[in-house]
């Protein structure tokens, strides 16, 4: 092209991919009539004719730019729409009169690359690896021109270093003719690398200017070997029987190594393996004192096969013994004196209390009880307990039961029953004493005895109601080696007079069964007068 | 073009060891991973083992200890040794490209079956 | 480990269908995953990569969405070369596959 040499640098035009590109014809007047204008695109040095302007209309040349090419401003601008990364070239605008000159115009086109797509090595790396290994990779799609890729680690610039840190790159064109940027980090990692936070930036260029964007950071599994190894036990404090102890093996090595858990026995001095759960935890539960012991666990690489072993740890099962009492089973006769002494083991310091097992009253705070001037009524269940301050919910009982010599006591002296004729009546009579007594009855039945407690018996009687039953009533006797006594049972017929509206309440403890002498499943309930109950 | 083929024993007995050998071409040991794919008859794929370009080598934990992975880069092999057999280890055992820019298999070899019976 | 599960395991469909198949993560995978079809007597083939990317040369009536535990394998029109077994794969810590969905013809 004559003069080729002298023409000025093109005029730069930026747009984004998919946006309008306007160049506009910068020939001046005095170099040509912009109502006479051929535009070019010139590709590979090659020019093809786009467009022609003749007295300010124009016309779209046949090719791959005949449907985006439009003029505006009076004939001046050539509006090229949807513009492709593939119009990225020099087009040029050729005045013809009064003599040829020419105005050239770079288009340059941009497009901003999708968020990098970041995605970590899924298997982890090794400290020890030979050369640097692939730690993450980073795809930026669809950018033009091609965007450049940053790592960071930590948020620092990473710089290829030999042998340490090796970034390797490389892109696609998509049919768009946008590009695909792909980059892998590889790197040499130490075990601190652990915690690195790497991600990777984009940098690239649209016409307002250097943007940039930053994939999510990422932390790679980092494989070291173990130096250390440690016991944990769980709960941690004071221990105690009953709990749920778990100890684990614990290492500084990623991945865990393979661990076993050893006790010493205090014999033999010799550690023994003790069986882990699945996890490598062994349980202890119900924790018992013979669990107290020195622990260590053992670790071992199985690809090395070298072992670690642990600082041994010292495990205390607290415990209190079976709580014994003297004496153990006490026998006093009326107005007497007796002391209560409890003992037992611990491995921390006792502290007992004596408690009234009836009533839960504290009697004394100590290991012994002495109780003086003792009545009937002293007679029935001493607790003692001794427990540990410092480790709540740590105690052990033991019950003793006093029993007071004296000739039967009864539950109540005479007692009003009501009745109906032909029926059968269940009838009940309570005695205490010590010894324990035996009850009789005045009146034939069927009588069965139930000890309630070593100084305690419950007798009862089914007896079929008869006129003569009706007219002497029925006695129980208890008696044992030191006397006896009697209640006297009162029966009393029903009749419609007799019966009150709450005349359907248990007396509780003797009740009266139908016959087959009255109707088929019926039931009468007797009913019991109130009065006071009277002992001795 | 990118190939990997399988060779091995088809048929091994209890107790015994397989070695499978994976041959690639196409493409360098030392620029793109591989890894070992099994599928037992009518079952999903499991992961087995795998060996990155640098030669780091990977397990599944399930087989650790049963599993070596190694290569030899001037014959474009990989070899893989599964000990102690059980029938249960029936499968098409396949090798598998990794991707040089991600973390998927990209290109498979047409598989081997192996099975284990006495 | 992280578990791969996919729904249905069975599908039947007619050529022409729009087809979505399920896959769920156990924990959040972010977008590792990869989509396969295998076909009987076959290997496995890539078909979707990073969750959503197309691998080269899959028609582009495969198409994958999701990220986090959730993804979607869709075929916006079935095609008779399409019946085949698809299974999706993590690789977000290890390699884990789902248990297959058979798509068959209805």
């Known amino acids: 092209v004559p003069g080729e040499a002298e023409q000025p640098a093109p005029e730069l035009v930026e747009v984004e991919v998919g946006s309008t590109a306007l160049l506009k014809c910068g020939l001046s007047q005095s170099q040509g009539n912009l109502s006479h204008v051929d535009w070019f695109s010139v590709h590979k040095e090659k020019r093809t004719l786009i467009f022609r302007v003749r007295q300010g209309q124009g016309q779209s040349e046949p090719g791959e730019y005949e449907q985006r090419l439009s003029l505006q401003d009076r004939g001046a601008t050539l509006a090229l729409t949807q513009v492709t990364p593939q119009d990225e070239r020099i087009f040029l605008c050729q005045g013809k009169r009064p003599r040829s000159q020419e105005y050239r115009i770079q288009l340059r086109v941009y497009k901003a690359p999708e968020e990098p797509n970041i995605q970590v090595n899924p298997l982890g790396i090794p400290v020890n690896s030979k050369e640097p290994e692939e730690v993450a990779t980073c795809v930026g799609r669809n950018g033009y021109p091609i965007p450049q890729v940053i790592w960071y680690k930590n948020g620092r610039p990473l710089k290829e270093e030999k042998n340490r840190v090796h970034i390797q790159s490389s892109q696609t064109v998509e049919s768009s003719g946008l590009y695909t940027l792909q980059s892998i980090l590889k790197a040499q990692l130490v075990k601190e690398d652990k915690d690195a936070q790497f991600y990777c930036e984009l940098n690239y260029r649209l016409p307002s200017g250097n943007h940039m964007k930053e994939s999510r950071e990422v932390t790679v599994p980092v494989f070291y070997p173990t130096e250390k190894v440690w016991l944990e036990v769980e709960p941690v404090g004071m221990l105690k029987e009953g709990d749920r102890v778990e100890i684990r093996c614990l290492a500084d090595g990623n991945p865990p190594p393979h661990f076993s858990i050893s006790k010493q026995n205090p014999s033999t001095r010799e550690a023994e393996e003790e069986t882990t759960n699945d996890n490598g935890v062994l349980v202890l539960e119900p924790a018992r004192k013979e669990h107290s012991g020195r622990y260590e666990c053992q670790a071992w690489n199985l690809d090395t096969m070298i072992s670690l072993l642990s600082e041994p740890q010292e495990l205390l099962v607290n415990y209190v013994s079976d709580v014994r009492v003297s004496p153990a089973a006490p026998e006093r006769q009326e107005g007497s004196s007796l002391t209560l002494t409890c003992e037992a083991e611990s491995s921390q310091d006792l502290e007992f209390q004596w408690l009234r097992e009836e009533t839960d009253q504290v009697l004394e705070r100590g290991p012994v009880l002495q109780l003086h001037d003792l009545k009937r009524e002293a007679g029935g269940g001493y607790r003692c307990v001794a427990s540990v301050p410092s480790i709540p919910g740590l105690n052990r009982t033991q019950l003793v039961k006093l029993a007071i010599f004296g000739p039967p006591w009864m539950a109540f002296k005479e007692r009003k029953v009501w009745v109906k004729e032909n029926m059968v009546l269940n009838l009940s009579c309570e005695a205490s004493g010590h010894p324990r007594p035996t009850i009789s009855w005045n009146v034939n039945g069927t009588a069965s005895e139930q000890d309630q407690d070593p100084q305690r018996v419950l007798s009862t009687l089914n007896v079929l109601v008869t006129p003569e039953l009706l007219e002497t009533g029925v006695e129980c006797t208890a008696s044992n080696d030191l006397g006896k006594n009697t209640s006297i049972l009162f029966l009393e017929l029903v009749n419609l007079t007799t019966l009150t509206p709450d005349s359907n309440t248990t007396t509780g403890l003797s009740t009266s069964t139908a016959s087959p002498h009255t109707r088929a499943n019926s039931t009468s309930t007797e009913r019991k007068l109130p009065e006071p109950e009277s002992r001795g | 073009q990118v190939t990997l083929k399988e060779s091995g024993p088809v048929l091994v007995k209890p107790t015994e060891t397989l070695t499978l050998t994976c041959t690639v071409s196409?493409?360098?040991?030392?620029?793109?991973?591989v890894s070992w794919v099994r599928q037992p008859p009518g079952k999903a794929l499991e992961w087995i083992a795998a060996?990155?370009?640098?030669?780091?080598?990977y397990y599944n934990s399930a087989f650790k200890s049963r599993l070596t992975i190694s290569r030899d880069t001037s014959k474009s092999q990989v070899v893989l040794t599964m000990t102690n057999m059980d029938p249960v280890d029936t499968a098409t055992y396949y090798c598998?490209?990794?991707?040089?820019?991600?973390?998927?298999?990209?290109?498979w070899g047409q598989g081997t079956l192996v099975t284990v019976s006495s | 480990d992280i578990q791969m599960t996919q729904s249905p395991s069975s599908l039947s469909a007619s050529v022409g269908d729009r087809v979505t198949i399920n896959c769920k993560a156990s924990?959040?995978?972010?977008?590792?995953l990869a989509w396969y079809q295998q076909k009987p007597g076959k290997a496995p083939k890539v078909l979707i990569f990073?969750?959503?990317s197309l691998q080269t040369g899959i028609p582009s009536r495969f198409s994958g969405s999701g990220s986090g535990t959730d993804f979607t394998l869709t075929i916006s029109s079935l095609q008779p070369e399409d019946f085949a077994t698809y299974y999706c794969?993590?690789?977000?810590?290890?390699?884990?596959f789902g248990q297959g969905t058979k798509l068959e013809i209805k």
């Open positions: 990073n969750a959503n």
């Open positions: 598998a490209r990794r991707y040089g820019y991600g973390w998927y298999f990209d290109f």
């Open positions: 924990q959040n995978i972010y977008n590792s």
């Open positions: 060996i990155s370009s640098g030669g780091t080598t």
């Open positions: 794969q993590q690789f977000y810590s290890g390699y884990t």
């Open positions: 196409g493409f360098s040991l030392t620029s793109s991973g």
